[in-house]
């Protein structure tokens, strides 16, 4: 089925929502004053070999559980991330965006990445797809 303007708009809004969530996480943790940043950086994330299409979001989906575990370290009284809710929201968006019709086997790069590199990669991906839709 060819994409309609309404489905393109919906995809764009979902990507913008995903982008905002990822940016919020990054801004919350990537602060040189964050007492836990150095320890958060010891966690490793798998990066996609290729991320150019919505189906590649499968690679993000598979890393959401490790992401939640690291985010459990990021809370403070003035920064209420609520990792479980946040990851759940991201998961819903990812599932809708990538679709469930086709099963895509994610291919990962050989090198692992830190949480900051991981988030930046998926932020760049989201921005790239949004730019092709507008």
């Amino acid at each position: 089925m060819a994409p309609t303007s309404s489905s393109t708009k919906k995809t764009q809004l979902q990507l913008e929502h995903l982008l905002l969530d990822l940016q919020m996480i990054l801004n919350g943790i990537n602060n040189y004053k964050n007492p836990k940043l150095t320890r958060m950086l010891t966690f490793k994330f798998y990066m996609p070999k290729k991320a150019t299409e919505l189906k590649h979001l499968q690679c993000l989906e598979e890393e959401l559980k490790p992401l939640e575990e690291v985010l459990n370290l990021a809370q403070s009284k003035n920064f209420h991330l609520r990792p479980r809710d946040l990851i759940s929201n991201i998961n819903v968006i990812v599932l809708e965006l990538k679709g469930s019709e086709t099963t895509f086997m994610c291919e990962y790069a050989d090198e692992t990445a830190t949480i900051v590199e991981f988030l930046n990669r998926w932020i760049t991906f989201s921005q790239s797809i949004i730019s092709t839709l507008t």
Epitope: N34, P35, K36, R39, L41, T42, K44, N72, S76
Partner: antibody
């Protein structure tokens, strides 16, 4: 019972290599970071570095960078601290400890019993 | 690195005494409303034991006579009524910035 059990006391000569261990039990070893702390005779505590046993990722106190290597083998729930060439000034008690950092906190809640390292010619 | 200065470095006390140990940091150890200051007890030949975390939280299993307070750069560990098993060395530790640092210790001896 959650515990960290360290290897026994070591007596070495300057220039020799050494690897001491810290074995975790009673909890999911890969879910918690392991820290290493030095205590020289009659002195206070100095933080050396940390390892994530799940990923192998490490972070060192600049003072100890290049002096020691921290590693882990998650298959046997064990973290290691090693020296390639010991000096007399490495004589100390070495502790491993478990880092807790969820929520609003960051502290060492479980400690190993310590490993005494004596370096003397 | 953040320097932690404990005072006194040692003192003598009797069982039943109220004991107060202070720890002063060279810069604030607070982050977004939380104080990253912990207290440990160490007895001769033994490993340190966690007493208080995040300035005022009592670790599970630690007697309620131990309490912690403070924020920013000034922190206090109080033992409301000293018991014979409390004679030990006490260390403060900041976990707000790497490298984590410890105070020089306060040795509590029997008078």
């Amino acid at each position: 019972e959650v515990q960290l059990v360290q290897s026994g006391a070591e007596v070495k000569k300057p220039g020799e290599s050494l690897k001491i261990s810290c074995k975790g039990s009673g909890y999911a070893f890969t879910n918690y970071l392991i820290e290493w702390v030095r205590q020289m005779p009659g002195k206070g505590l100095e933080w050396m570095g940390v390892i994530n046993p799940g990923s192998g990722g490490t972070y060192y106190n600049e003072k100890f960078k290049g002096q020691v290597t921290i590693s882990a083998d998650k298959s046997i729930s064990t973290a290691y601290l090693q020296w390639s060439s010991l000096k007399a000034s490495d004589t100390a008690m070495y502790y491993c400890a478990r880092w807790r950092g969820e929520g609003y906190y960051a502290y060492f809640d479980v400690w190993g019993q310590g490993t005494t390292v004596t370096v003397s010619s | 690195a953040i320097r932690l200065t404990q005072s006194p470095s040692s003192f003598s006390a009797s069982t039943g005494d109220r004991v107060t140990i202070t720890c002063k940091a060279s810069q604030s150890v607070d982050y977004q409303g939380d104080s990253y200051m912990n207290w440990y007890q160490q007895k001769p030949g033994k490993a340190p034991k966690l007493l208080i975390y995040s300035a005022s939280n009592l670790e599970s299993g630690v007697p309620s006579r131990f309490s912690g307070s403070g924020s920013g750069t000034d922190f206090t560990l109080t033992i409301s009524s000293l018991q014979s098993e409390d004679f030990a060395t006490y260390y403060c530790q900041q976990s707000n910035e790497d490298p984590y640092t410890f105070g020089g210790g306060t040795k509590v001896e029997i008078k």
